[in-house]
């Protein structure tokens, strides 16, 4: 047979679906690998073929589209399960071909079991919402295309295992869930169960979103350096260990890159001949504000080291800050770096 453009196993698309629920899986070729869509390909005489490899097997086999009640079917570029079974787990391949052209890609599909409280091995999307903001809405995700717009499904929302009824600041509104003046106590897993009829059968879709309440943009600040500061003097004798913590508070800023670094006499520690160790630790508040600590240590400090200028620097998307440490030699009245 002719050569086939094999895109291999697309592990970027680790598709997880719940057992005993409908699943519609689009062939990734048209979304990520090819420049044209299914309709264009189909009208050009190309055929889409599906096959799969069962979990823990090497043998590729065709998908059985003749199961009772059309449990597995294909519609355009979508593979349908109505519903899934646990042993549908495996690697699925969609291949687009005619007599002169061939392109294919495989992707893993995992059918996941859940318990009555929606606990499972499923990875949930995380929705970050700002604390104290007026209203936040989350929408039941990934339910498009399962039923026509003429069908009005029933939707039930849960927080953890508890149906959301008379929650004071959380209001279910069909496919949406509204949060009014959210607080950290609103953190958690929120699950929508969508029930819709199709051909005389009722199907359920279960979708969970992890809500994380984070600091508000109105509270966002440039970095605040707690240490070093002007009140603490690091007074050492030669031969002693010098330990200076650089402790910086970063308010939560969505997608901000928070940086902390030391300079010694204006140079990065790597560019200085001093034997310096730097250890970093990070802690987070309940609203994902970050406290980043970089501890600079010199095991056996020299008189020359005690004359150097140690400056802690910090940066986020709101600005920069820097603070020099007050270092002096014991018995030496000079707190400023000495110039000989």
């Amino acid at each position: 047979s002719e050569r086939c453009d094999d895109w291999g196993l697309d592990t970027m698309r680790q598709i997880q679906v719940f057992e005993d629920e409908p699943a519609r899986i689009k062939c990734p070729l048209f979304e990520h690998f090819l420049k044209y869509n299914y309709s264009t390909a189909h009208s050009s005489g190309l055929t889409l073929i599906w096959y799969w490899t069962r979990q823990d097997r090497d043998l590729e086999e065709p998908i059985n589209f003749r199961l009772p009640e059309n449990r597995i079917s294909k519609e355009k570029d979508v593979l349908w399960f109505r519903p899934t079974l646990l042993n549908d787990t495996g690697n699925y391949t969609c291949m687009l071909r005619n007599t002169t052209y061939c392109s294919k890609v495989a992707f893993p599909l995992e059918v996941v079991q859940k318990d009555s409280c929606f606990n499972s091995a499923m990875r949930f999307p995380v929705h970050k919402m700002y604390i104290e903001h007026g209203i936040h809405k989350i929408t039941c995700p990934n339910v498009d295309g399962y039923f026509p717009s003429s069908v009005k499904p029933s939707v039930t929302w849960y927080k953890g295992c508890t149906e959301i009824v008379d929650f004071h600041n959380v209001l279910p509104e069909g496919m949406n869930l509204s949060f009014f003046i959210p607080l950290v106590s609103n953190n958690g897993n929120y699950t929508c169960v969508v029930t819709y009829p199709e051909n005389g059968r009722l199907f359920h879709l279960t979708r969970t979103v992890t809500v994380k309440v984070v600091g508000s943009p109105k509270d966002a600040l440039p970095p605040q350096i707690y240490s070093p500061n002007d009140r603490v003097v690091y007074e050492k004798e030669p031969g002693e260990e010098l330990v200076i913590p650089c402790k910086v508070y970063f308010s939560f800023i969505m997608d901000s890159h928070n940086e902390v670094w030391w300079t010694i006499d204006g140079k990065k520690p790597d560019d200085v001949t001093v034997d310096i160790t730097i250890n970093e630790s990070v802690s987070y508040s309940s609203t994902e504000d970050e406290t980043r600590t970089q501890i600079l240590s010199i095991k056996k400090v020299t008189p020359e080291d005690l004359r150097r200028n140690y400056v802690c620097h910090a940066r986020n998307t709101k600005g920069e800050a820097e603070q020099a440490a007050k270092v002096k030699q014991k018995g030496n009245g000079c707190t400023e770096p000495m110039t000989l």
Partner: antibody, heavy 118, light 107 residues
Framework: EVQLLESGGGLVQPGGSLRLSCAAS????????MGWVRQAPGKGLEWVSA????????LYADSVKGRFTISRDNSKNTLYLQMNSLRAEDTAVYYC???????????WGQGTLVTVSS | EIVMTQSPATLSVSPGERATLSCRAS??????LAWYQQKPGQAPRLLIY???TRATGIPARFSGSGSGTEFTLTISSLQSEDFAVYYC?????????FGQGTKVEIK
Amino acid sequence: EVQLLESGGGLVQPGGSLRLSCAASGFIFSTYGMGWVRQAPGKGLEWVSAISYDGEGTLYADSVKGRFTISRDNSKNTLYLQMNSLRAEDTAVYYCARFRYYTAFDYWGQGTLVTVSS
Amino acid sequence: EIVMTQSPATLSVSPGERATLSCRASQSVSSNLAWYQQKPGQAPRLLIYGASTRATGIPARFSGSGSGTEFTLTISSLQSEDFAVYYCQQYNNWPWTFGQGTKVEIK
């Protein structure tokens, strides 16, 4: 200096309406959530309503839901409480207070007395 | 809603003595608990937030402790101006709720 000054209280008949105002100064009003707390004569404190700093989110105690409406005008640094269908049990001193999620109600007004009686 | 229960209802203490006020939540409120002081004819004043952090300008004789469901306000040495009603309040969940108050009176 943070100051909150309520006004609009008074005597009103059952079923009547009243609009309370709270003028804020000494802080950036538009960055704080605001709330109303009431205290019936000789009783304890009861949270009534809250509004987000941007005015979009509002919450109410079950005892006033559907009858009271909280609002704010950030351009005027003023908080409001529209009280309709008033009942005798709404008789109380009404305080406005500012809040943050980490300090709760950190500053309070001096209160305004609402008396519902025929 | 979370019910806050304060005890005792009234506490009789001599000036200079220590006063210990308790507050219990019907479910965990983490450390999201505040204490307020109210004197007759005045608005409440924030004393403690975050269960243990003193608000601006509050004397060191006031201290708060606890987390979850059990909280304590301690006044180490009562001054004449400390005789008042004290309220605890949870702000972990909406609706925010207050305890019924503890009256600290002169013995």
